[in-house]
């Protein structure tokens, strides 16, 4: 058995997390899991879902009662998601911690807008997807 | 030339970021987005950096003199990132759109934590990962 | 000041057992992945093993797999290294190393070593 | 399988620069963080480098890390060379896929 199965089953006492009713009005996140099966979409809805968890953790980085209930399901997910690649994780954390609201920040996120648009798709790299049209209408 | 890029070039100019100055103590996501060459570790960044990006957005909405380039931006990031996919897009919000604080949406997040680490790391479906021990001792 | 201190080596016959010690001082224990590192004489530093912080997952270098076993007890702030089966080629100085807190961290703090000779 | 390989052998003479170079092979250097150990002779291996660049409080600013992901190595540069810094200098990173801890083969540097 992995090692956060015991510890997330801690968190669900802490948290009042059992009882079946709070399963209603749908989940959160693993309808939106079953939707997706390919791989890179999986990455783009996991990598949500993980920066989630780690904003939850955060806020109950002090309570003792669950803090090594906390670090052990951390440390499970850093080596299930980011396959304990520490600059995997870093990396991801920075782009967690950005500040929207901070001024330099936006600066440098419109400066480096073009080239990040330019390397969104698979395409960019592997010229296989074929654009007949640019139809968005969301 | 793709749509984005003459109204990301009105955007510098509305934000002033296209002083070299900007570039000052390295990029936000360029430096990161190198790292990176694998798909599925490329869509766990763009992931991230889509958010930010989306948020920002969000903060300028009712900004009349930038609003349409804001909106083909995003149009493009629609076509390129979600593959004018909109069930992948809205799914994609929905996830960034969860409050931490609020109590319902923690304990539904603690409720699924299982099911979503059993689905975290590739290993999970294709049974490549090798875990020398699980030597779990509470 | 972190201190890792091993213990526990020494002569063994080939096919026999020894098991080795680190005792860890000056950090949260629990936090830190653990590894082991050896170096036969007179050559280049070699992974033999690493745990998580927890003592939840271990991994292996290859040549050890099998007959080796790292363990870890975070309430008494000691990592451990079980090493059975022993060959001539396993003879090294044996070095406990303390990790971040992801395994695929650096090394960042080392303790003197250990010998082991594994002879007949 | 990662692998790293480094020179066997580099000497250079006092208060000049040298580079060790550390090259990967089997995968891209650039994913997983890159550290460097001093080992001077009978004694255990000490961190110069961590995290592809980052030096250790107490290590002087003489040493250096890098990253060059176009030809998939890492370098550590000392500059002003002194006799303290005659020692094996080891580079060492991580591979995801199996999770093992990567050493490279040593140098052995010398100040002449």
């Known amino acids: 058995q992995d090692p956060y199965v015991k510890e997330a089953e801690n968190l669900k006492k802490y948290f009042n997390a059992g009882h079946s009713d709070v399963a209603d009005n749908g989940t959160l996140f693993l309808g939106i899991l079953k939707n997706w099966k390919e791989e890179s979409d999986r990455k783009i809805m996991q990598s949500q879902i993980v920066s989630f968890y780690f904003k939850l953790f955060k806020n109950f980085k002090d309570d003792q009662s669950i803090q090594k209930s906390v670090e052990t399901i951390k440390e499970d997910m850093n080596v299930k998601f980011f396959n304990s690649n520490k600059k995997k994780r870093d990396d991801f954390e920075k782009l967690t911690n950005y500040s929207v609201t901070d001024l330099n920040v936006q600066r440098k996120a419109i400066h480096e807008l073009i080239q990040v648009m330019a390397e969104l798709s698979p395409a960019a790299k592997t010229g296989k997807r074929k654009r007949s049209q640019m139809l968005f209408r969301g | 030339q793709d749509p984005y890029v003459k109204e990301a070039e009105n955007l510098k100019k509305y934000f002033n970021a296209g002083h070299s100055d900007v570039a000052d103590n390295g990029t936000l996501f360029l430096g990161i987005l190198k790292n990176w060459k694998e798909e599925s570790d490329r869509k766990i960044m763009q992931s991230q950096i889509v958010s930010f990006y989306f948020k920002l957005f969000k903060n300028f909405k009712d900004d009349q003199s930038i609003q349409k380039s804001v909106e083909t931006i995003k149009e493009d990031m629609n076509v390129k990132f979600f593959n004018s996919n909109k069930k992948k897009r809205d799914d994609f919000e929905k996830l960034t759109n969860y409050s931490v604080t609020d109590l319902n949406v923690q304990r539904k997040a603690i409720h699924e934590l299982i099911q979503v680490m059993a689905e975290l790391s590739p290993a999970a479906k294709t049974g490549k990962r090798k875990r020398s021990q699980m030597l779990f001792r509470g | 000041e972190v201190q890792l201190l091993e213990s526990g080596g020494g002569l063994v016959q080939p096919g026999g057992s020894l098991k080795l010690s680190c005792a860890a001082s000056?950090?949260?224990?629990?936090?830190?992945?653990m590894s082991w590192v050896r170096q036969a004489p007179g050559k280049g530093l070699e992974w033999v093993s690493t745990l998580t912080g927890s003592g939840g997952t271990a991994y292996y270098a290859d040549s050890v797999e099998g007959r080796f076993s790292i363990s870890r007890d975070n309430s008494k702030n000691t990592l451990y290294l079980q090493m059975n089966s022993l060959r001539a080629e396993d003879t090294a100085v044996y070095y406990c190393a303390k990790g971040t807190e992801l395994v695929g961290g650096g090394l960042d703090n080392w303790g003197q070593g250990t010998l082991v000779t594994v002879s007949s | 399988n990662f692998m790293l390989t480094q020179p066997h052998s580099l000497s250079e003479s006092p208060g000049k620069t040298v580079t060790i170079s550390c090259t990967g092979s089997?995968?891209?250097?650039?994913?997983?963080?890159v550290q460097w150990y001093q080992q001077r002779p009978g004694s255990a291996p000490t961190t110069v480098i961590h995290?592809?660049?980052?030096?250790p409080s107490g290590v002087p600013d003489r040493f250096s890390g890098s990253i060059d992901g176009s030809s998939n190595s890492a370098s550590l540069t000392i500059s002003g060379l002194q006799p303290e810094d005659e020692a094996d200098y080891y580079c060492q990173s991580y591979d995801s896929d199996n999770h093992h801890v990567v050493f490279g083969g040593g140098t052995k540097l010398t100040v002449l």
């Open positions: 089997g995968g891209s250097i650039a994913t997983n963080y």
């Open positions: 995290e592809d660049n980052q030096r």
């Open positions: 000056g950090f949260t224990f629990s936090s830190n992945a």
